[in-house]
């Protein structure tokens, strides 16, 4: 159940998709990737207040227990709900190849 | 790619399965669940240092960018990789029913 999408902390403060520009060097890929030279990395960043974008029952439980035992149980965490693929041109033993990575770019986010 | 399972922070400090005992009242379920009265909630808790139990390429990217931009990009987060089902006896409009929840108890953990 995708619970409330209203962020009680103010606009843009809660779990949502962000884009971070990164070079191959930033990612540690310079020695095995030829292209793209720069990646617009989409990732999930932000707070997960009570029931905000709760991914499932487990997230709801976590919210309840975090409220009771904040030192023991962490709040839910903002993570990808799904991904967009990305194609890299990468070096191989025999030369160069196209390779699709299905779990590289976050597509949308939820709290878990 | 399930990367290193060795925790550099010391035993038990990194992302792993924990069990937290919770009553129906703790979970806010007392008004709609009859049984069990107490749940051994398994959840994922702990730090996600570099490449520890990295769930996928996205987690590896997040680690790299967190190292570069710690104020912008959070470290990967410890979340369930899979779940164990749990059966609840719950109240319904017509009486009582058994209901299986597939996403309630964490089975194992990874960093994402």
């Amino acid at each position: 159940a995708r619970n409330g999408d209203h962020c009680p902390l103010g606009p843009g403060r809660c779990c949502r998709l962000h884009t971070v520009r990164a070079s191959l060097e930033d990612l540690g890929w310079a020695d095995w990737v030829l292209s793209p030279r720069e990646v617009q990395v989409t990732m999930c960043i932000g707070a997960c207040p009570s029931q905000f974008r709760a991914a499932n029952m487990h997230a709801q439980i976590k919210t309840s227990l975090h409220r009771l035992k904040p030192d023991t149980v962490p709040a839910p965490c903002c993570v990808p709900a799904s991904y967009n693929p990305m194609v890299l041109i990468q070096k191989t033993d025999t030369g160069v190849s196209l390779q699709t990575y299905d779990d590289l770019l976050a597509k949308d986010c939820h709290c878990i | 790619a399930r990367n290193g399972d060795h925790c550099p922070l010391g035993p038990g400090r990194c992302c792993r399965l924990h069990t937290v005992r919770a009553s129906l009242e703790d979970l806010g379920w007392a008004d709609w669940v009859l049984s069990p009265r107490e749940v051994q909630v398994t959840m994922c808790i702990g730090a996600c240092p570099s490449q520890f139990r990295a769930a996928n390429m996205h987690a590896q990217i997040k680690t790299s960018l967190h190292r570069l931009k710690p104020d912008t990009v959070p470290a990967p987060c410890c979340v369930p990789a899979s779940y164990n089902p749990m059966v609840l006896i719950q109240k319904t409009d017509t009486g009582v029913s058994l209901q299986t929840y597939d996403d309630l108890l964490a089975k194992d953990c990874h960093c994402i």
């Epitope: 793209p36 693929p85 041109i89 025999t94 190849s97 | -």
Partner: antibody, heavy 121, light 110 residues
Amino acid sequence: EVQLLESGGGLVQPGGSLRLSCAVSGFSLSSYDMTWVRQAPGKGLEWIGIISNSGSTYYASWAKGRFTISKDSSKNTVYLQMNSLRAEDTAVYFCARGILVYADYGDHNLWGQGTLVTVSS
Amino acid sequence: DIVMTQSPATLSVSPGERATLSCQASEDIYTNLAWFQQKPGQPPRLLIYAASTLASGIPARFSGSGSGTEFTLTISSLQSEDFAVYYCLGVYTYISAEGAFGQGTKVEIK
């Protein structure tokens, strides 16, 4: 010796289908990407698509849906399945090793001689 | 969709002269670009890959430059065997991958 040999071309009616083959020798398809390119008579080159060493496929937008690239590594053969053929698909069809914009190790210019497909009633 | 645009369509040059061919990509393709030479009845011949690297067996009078969206093939001193059609090929990768050839530049004897 490393070689590519296309076959399967010929005359086909509009709306028909054809499967072209590219038999390779001297290397393994599990190690190299393969590209299909075509050239209509008197016209320029047209990129059709690629099958990667792992079997992933990538197509030109105009080819999606009608053209399918596949391979049988045990037979060392790459295929181009063409459906709903039209007169404008008349061309020489080439297969080539690699993704072309970067060179693989060894021979940098591995193309077949091409096979002619004529779509006409 | 990626579109590669070559100019000029035809280039008339005298033997021994310099020829400069241009290729423009509709997307940033970094150095994902190759240049090919084609003569009638033959498959294309790779000249330059990775925008500027000379393929094996290709004379040093051929050179490539550029990155991103603007690319150039230069033939420093045209020989009789260089009169042919030249094509650029770009490959764009991101969420998917797609390639496209330019429409070609015919280099003819002036």
